[in-house]
């Protein structure tokens, strides 16, 4: 049985200051190390305890990093992406895509499958509309009594 996972996808600019032990996270992905099927993007695989990213608190394991200091991370070899981070300087600006899972299904590990899903608003808008129609109908019914 195939499950379905829906995601709320948001983007955020995260500015980190390199700490004594660096930025404090690990990455997976790249054209030679696809982490998500049909996606050679760069993903955060581990946030290190007490590192700069952990202390900042915004970067999360599973986030996709779109750019570093304005430089796009598309179509990079894994090691080239690593080197880009290592040479990014003291102040590092990350453009990050967060994926908030809003519904669980019987699927495999997130990141090792298909990340596609439907945005939450596509679920919430029809539900909200139905609720409003039902409320309106109920009020009309009460007025007729």
């Amino acid at each position: 049985m195939n499950g379905r996972v829906d995601y709320l996808v948001t983007e955020e600019e995260i500015n980190l200051t390199r700490g004594p032990s660096g930025l404090g996270f690990n990455i997976v992905g790249g054209t030679d190390q696809q982490y998500v099927s049909n996606d050679s993007g760069i993903y955060v695989s581990r946030i290190k305890e007490n590192g700069a990213a952990a202390l900042d608190g915004r970067l999360q394991e599973g986030d996709k990093i779109l750019s570093v200091n304005g430089q796009d991370l598309k179509n990079l070899l894994h090691q080239d992406a690593v080197d880009l981070f290592r040479n990014a300087g003291y102040a590092v600006s990350l453009r990050v895509q967060h994926r908030l899972q809003v519904q669980n299904g019987p699927i495999g590990h997130r990141g090792e499958g298909d990340p596609s899903g439907i945005p939450i608003f596509m679920v919430l808008v029809p539900v909200f509309a139905l609720t409003m129609v039902a409320a309106w109908a109920f009020m009309r019914y009460r007025q007729q009594l």
């Epitope: 190390q33 290190k48 090792e112």
Partner: nanobody, 127 residues
Framework: EVQLVESGGGLVQAGDSLRLSCVAS????????MGWFRQAPGKERDFVAA????????YYEDSVKGRFTISRDNAKNTVYLQMNSLKPEDTAVYYC?????????????????????WGQGTQVTVS
């Protein structure tokens, strides 16, 4: 995280060889940088060798260079440590360790804190 199980330890004579294996399960092995550490009784856990996710880079502790070889087979989810010309001072519990992904910081492969998954260890005794 990945689960790691070591095997291949045992009791050997000085000058003999052993090959340790570490089998991984639970997550895609090829995303992991792998390392071997050892701990002698009453001592700290020390770095022995490490290998990058692709196998393209290897690192060794000075005292084992030329005697030990780390390798991996991503198709078999296994990392190996070939130990030749064993010495009594190689006696220890040998641990396999995995680091999920590549650090974006300067990589210190000898730092146990770089690794997030550990095996239970296998005893190597050289008499």
């Amino acid at each position: 995280e990945v689960q790691l199980v070591e095997s291949g330890g045992g009791l050997v004579q000085a000058g003999d060889s052993l090959r340790l294996s570490c089998v991984a399960s639970g997550r895609t092995f090829s995303y992991y940088g792998m390392g071997w550490f050892r701990q002698a009784p009453g001592k700290e856990r020390d770095f022995v060798a490490a290998i990058s996710w692709s196998g393209g880079s290897t690192y060794y502790e000075d005292s084992v260079k030329g005697r030990f070889t780390i390798s991996r087979d991503n198709a078999k989810n296994t990392v190996y440590l070939q130990m030749n010309s064993l010495k009594p001072e190689d006696t220890a519990v040998y641990y396999c360790a995995g680091a999920f992904g590549s650090t974006v910081d300067n990589y210190d492969h000898s730092d146990p804190r770089e690794y997030d998954s550990w095996g239970q260890g296998t005893q190597v005794t050289v008499s």
